[in-house]
């Protein structure tokens, strides 16, 4: 982590990807400690705060503006050397987001995947972005970068993620950058939750009063398991959003969640999954599918069982 003998290590916290108006601390680690250091910005855009200044421990930059985007290096204090300073550190790229319209992010074949599969995350925009960046929330390392391909007035890049393991599950966002300003990134795409299934035993799914009901009759789907899942997720075939509920321990030592669907009008095929609070994006195997059938004349379509979840709602704890 620390680089060469005479080379300090420059790092940023909380992240190298910083929104306009955010703050970032640059830390220059040298010779087993934080000594005095100087900061350099490698490109031509002038950041006057660094001119001839010496910093201790860390330098806090902010509120950041597009001019702060770029490559930084530091030199550590070395009093007994000829120059008084170390060799330059590793280059550290600070990317500033929020400078262009957000791109779109899609998952192919979809955001719900089995362990071991590969997913393509496609970032695209009608802004002619030269590069696209993909970033997973909570990861401190630099985002993946791809050159944008331009076809029919759309620029896009396909990021291949896989084979999928629990560590790759989470909330992804992508950004674009235009030529000549490679580190001034767009606003983030809407978040996309990548969920990995198939890691734990499947729960069981049942319907009350039963899987075949009269039109207008109230239906509740119950998901349960002997495994101590914290959350259950209910999905309906053909619908993008899932619904989730906290699992409740029952007297028979199972863990259960009851999803009220309201008055039945149209049927559908349902599945449920279990997950643990510590890994909200890693789900169990799917329950066996449950086909809910409605007899009689439905007057309108069944109310969606899943009011759309918040934009990045799946990979978040349920409180």
């Amino acid at each position: 982590l620390m680089g060469g003998q005479d080379k300090p290590f420059l790092s940023a916290r909380p992240s190298t990807v910083v929104p306009r108006g955010g703050h970032v601390a640059l830390q220059c680690h040298y010779r087993r400690g934080f000594n005095n250091f100087m900061l350099y910005k490698e490109d031509r855009s002038h950041v006057p705060i660094f001119h001839g200044r010496i910093f201790q421990e860390s330098f806090i930059m902010g509120p950041v503006t597009p001019a702060h985007a770029g490559t930084y290096r530091c030199r550590g204090s070395r009093p007994h050397s000829l120059t008084g300073w170390s060799a330059p550190s590793n280059p550290l790229v600070i990317m500033v987001t929020g400078n262009h319209r957000k791109p779109s992010l899609l998952a192919h074949p979809g955001p719900l995947l089995k362990s071991g599969e590969t997913v393509i995350l496609q970032c695209w925009s009608d802004v002619m972005f030269e590069h696209f960046f993909l970033h997973r929330e909570g990861i401190s390392e630099d985002p993946s970068r791809l050159v944008g391909q331009i076809h029919d007035g759309v620029s896009k890049a396909n990021f291949s993620i896989g084979p999928l393991m629990p560590v790759l599950a989470g909330t992804y966002r992508c950004y674009g950058s235009v030529p000549h300003s490679p580190y001034q990134l767009s606003a983030p795409s809407d978040p996309l939750d990548i969920v990995i299934t198939g890691l734990y035993e499947k729960p069981s799914l049942s319907a009350q009063p039963g899987p075949t009901v009269q039109a207008g009759e109230n239906v509740t789907l119950s998901c349960s398991s002997w495994s101590s899942y914290d959350i259950y997720h209910l999905s309906r075939e053909g619908e993008a959003h899932e619904r989730r509920l906290r699992a409740v321990p029952k007297v028979n030592r199972t863990f259960q969640a009851d999803f009220p669907l309201g008055p039945a009008t149209h049927g559908g095929t349902y599945r449920c999954f279990g997950s643990f609070r510590a890994l909200p994006c890693v789900w169990s195997n799917s329950s066996d599918p449950l086909l809910v059938s409605v007899t009689g004349n439905p007057s309108s379509s069944w109310p969606s069982p899943t009011e759309p979840s918040s934009k990045s709602g799946i990979c978040r704890h349920l409180h």
Epitope: P19, R20, G21, H23, A25, T65, G98, E137, G138, T171
Partner: antibody, heavy 120, light 107 residues
């Protein structure tokens, strides 16, 4: 001690403009960014934008981009906000606030507020 | 833009009660969160910054906690002067949005 003194209440007609001030004292004006916050009657707080008095760099909430112009006079340690094309919806209390220092800074000092009433 | 969802929007409590107000960000804000108290006709006053740090002069009955997207302001034992409106605000990139506010009233 740090103080932010704002100009007095204003009553304006729709379509007019107004320029309000925030005079800073007790600290180095150019070392901190100055922010503006709006509060409509009975409503919550809305961030309008900020100016870095040292560089003149400004950034606005998109919602107020065409409405506000932020400036600063370093010789008098005063920040200004001009609101144009006033409408009744601009009736509010406008606060200036200093953004503190550190990695996780808050608005550590606030002005007392300038009440703007827009009415025909 | 980051949305800040504050709950509850109003709360009735008695002197001596323990009160908790929560604020949820639409994405990780890395503890870039402040809490303010506002009384009628007055400017907001800083209570807590960096999610957990008490501002100078703020009584120790106030405390902040949380990280990532979820944050809490707790008043351990309500005093008569604590009845006011409370706001959270994030600083992880502009616009620095506020929560909708929580009006704390005497029961």
């Amino acid at each position: 001690q740090v103080q932010l003194q704002q100009s007095g209440a204003e009553v304006k007609k729709p379509g007019a403009s107004v320029k309000m001030s925030c005079k800073a004292s007790g600290y180095t004006f150019t070392s901190y960014t100055m922010h503006w916050v709006r509060q409509a009657p009975g409503q919550g707080l809305e961030w309008i934008g900020y100016i870095n008095p040292s560089s003149g760099y400004t950034e606005n909430n998109r919602k107020f981009k065409d409405k506000t112009t932020l400036t600063a006079d370093t010789s008098t340690s005063t920040a200004y906000m001009e609101l144009s094309s006033l409408r009744s919806e601009d009736t509010a209390v406008y606060y200036c606030a200093r953004l503190g220092k550190g990695l996780l800074p808050p608005f550590d000092y606030w002005g007392q507020g300038t009440t703007l009433t827009v009415s025909s | 833009d980051i949305q800040m969802t504050q709950s509850p929007s109003s709360l009735s409590a008695s002197v001596g009660d323990r009160v908790t107000i929560t604020c949820r960000a639409s994405e990780n804000i890395y503890s870039n969160l402040a809490w303010y108290q506002q009384k009628p006709g007055k400017a907001p006053q800083l209570l807590v910054y960096a999610a957990t740090n008490l501002a100078d002069g703020v009584p120790s009955r106030f405390s902040g906690s949380g990280s990532g997207t979820d944050y809490t302001l707790t008043i351990s034992s309500l005093q008569p002067e604590d009845f006011a409106t409370y706001y959270c605000q994030h600083f992880w990139g502009t616009p620095y949005t506020f929560g909708g506010g929580t009006k704390l009233e005497i029961k």
